[in-house]
């Protein structure tokens, strides 16, 4: 039950995270005009990975796409690539994890296959989350560098006669969405990996050999002085799981492929 919950929660958290990564990638507000300590303008500039926008006080917003590929900064291209890789891996991870969910039955899929799929999706979510966090962090670093550069040359002009205020950019909402989404995807991936451990069918260390006496039924188990004495047909054989002796009543029952949760 705990494994199913962990797997399900991991899936949901990753789903939210990937939706957030997609949202962040599509958002226009990766960098926004810094309003602090600047003259108040009737124009607000903000930029995304795909286009830059200008919102005027009039209410009119104009967005222009970056219609060049070669003319864009290498860092921007790298961020785009990281975000897209994150989305692709996340999407594949989601697809894999749907079939890996314990609550979904596909034919006669073995638990071992489900465990492998869960692990695969978990790793994909972790890498996806890391890609998003890396992409957003690279962009943030780029912004910080440019911010201090433009602060150093805040005013430029002809002999100081005419002042041209340089537009400085600061962190936009998309960066925070990206960080949170990347973190959620990462957490979801870790949860899937944890769930995988519980899903894997555990092999018995020893094969139990039972000897039935006529009146007295004694089960001898090599590898430990663990034996059970029972009377008549009430005898319950004990299986040793990882060296621990527990009655079948006590052994945690993992749903087999015939169980419906």
């Amino acid at each position: 039950m705990a494994v199913t919950a962990c797997q399900g929660l991991g899936f949901v958290v990753s789903l939210i995270g990937i939706a957030g990564i997609i949202a962040a990638t599509c958002m226009d507000q990766w960098s926004t005009q810094d309003l602090y300590n600047n003259p108040v303008t009737a124009v607000f500039n903000y930029q995304g990975l795909w286009r830059s926008c200008v919102r005027e006080s009039s209410g009119f917003t104009e967005c222009r796409g970056y219609f060049t590929l070669l003319g864009l900064p290498a860092m921007l291209q790298a961020v785009r690539a990281l975000m897209i890789v994150g989305i692709v891996l996340g999407a594949i991870g989601l697809l894999v994890s749907i079939f890996a969910l314990k609550c979904i039955r596909i034919g006669s899929m073995e638990d071992s296959a489900k465990a492998n799929m869960t692990l695969t999706s978990g790793i994909m979510f972790i890498v996806s989350g890391l890609c998003a966090i890396a992409g957003v962090s690279v962009f943030a670093n780029m912004l910080v560098t440019n911010f201090w550069m433009s602060t150093a040359n805040m005013y430029t002009g002809m002999g100081g006669m005419v002042q041209t205020v340089q537009t400085r950019y600061t962190f936009g909402a998309a960066l925070f969405v990206g960080w949170v989404a990347g973190g959620l995807t990462l957490i979801g991936g870790v949860m899937m990996c944890i769930a995988c451990r519980g899903l894997a069918p555990e092999e018995t260390n020893y094969k139990a050999v039972s000897y039935h006496a006529s009146g007295h039924s004694v089960a001898y188990k090599p590898g430990g002085f663990k034996a059970s004495t029972g009377f008549g047909s009430n005898t319950k054989n004990k299986k040793i799981y990882d060296g621990g002796a527990r009655t079948e009543d006590e052994v945690q029952s993992y749903p087999s492929k015939h169980d419906y949760v």
Epitope: T41, V43, E56, S57, V162
Partner: antibody, heavy 118, light 113 residues
């Protein structure tokens, strides 16, 4: 057709108050930033106040800050300018304007005259 | 505050003449985000509110005759009337639409000789 009609002007004593209204029609009022501009006799226009479409951003000219309040009622398609502590230098024709591309004042009303005199 | 300086303060012209008036701002009105200059030109006739002629320094408002042309960038702007008509006699104002407060120039009065 875009139409802006100002009202509420008149003669007022120094230190007095007045509330101007601007009824808008012919466009989506809640989509545009609006402004008040005044023009003293034989002088050039002077921007007074601005309010964004959602009233999130409000700006005033230094000469009126603390004395004038701009507001809008999008449900009624109406812009307001509440003026208090009026001075003789506030005497002017007050125009209501709708902003357009480039933050230009694309449409103007015919104005309402405010006279501050003892 | 941004200071808008218009010159000359008045112009005496004859019909059909080409007229040029200047407007200078104390700071650049060029927005780096869209490479547009936030400068507007208005025409005002006696007893009327100002009328929008040109926005973004060079974009003509719809319905404005093509004899009106705006040019310039950064801090120096020009309004040109290629062939002055009698109905063009008015006061022309430039306005900063980039920084608050949204300041106007003192105007250039166009008069007939």
């Amino acid at each position: 057709e875009v139409k802006l009609v100002e009202s509420g002007g008149g003669l007022v004593q120094p230190g007095g108050s007045l509330k101007l209204s601007c009824a808008a029609s012919g466009f989506g009022f809640s989509d545009y930033g609006m402004a008040w501009v005044r023009q003293a006799p034989r002088k050039g226009p002077e921007w007074v106040a601005f309010i964004s479409n959602s009233a999130y951003s409000i700006y005033y000219a230094d000469t009126v800050t603390g004395r004038f309040t701009i507001s809008r009622e999008n449900a009624k398609n109406t812009l307001y300018l509440e003026m208090s502590s009026l001075r003789s230098e506030d005497t002017a024709m007050y125009y209501c304007a709708r902003l357009g591309y480039g933050n230009s004042f694309a449409y103007w009303g015919q104005g309402t005259l405010v006279t501050v005199s003892a | 505050d941004i200071v808008m300086t218009q010159s000359p303060s008045s112009l005496t012209v004859t019909a059909g003449e080409k007229v040029t008036m200047s407007c200078k701002s104390s700071q650049s009105l060029l927005n780096s985000g869209n490479q547009k200059n936030y400068l507007t030109w208005y025409q005002q006739k006696p007893g009327q509110p100002p009328k929008l002629l040109i926005y973004w320094a060079s974009t003509r408002e719809s319905g404005v005759p093509d004899r009106f042309t705006g040019s310039g960038s950064g801090t120096d702007f020009t309004l040109t009337i290629s062939s002055v008509q009698a109905e063009d006699l008015a006061v022309y104002y430039c306005q900063n639409n980039y920084y608050y407060p949204l300041t106007f120039g003192a105007g250039t009065k166009l008069e007939l000789k």
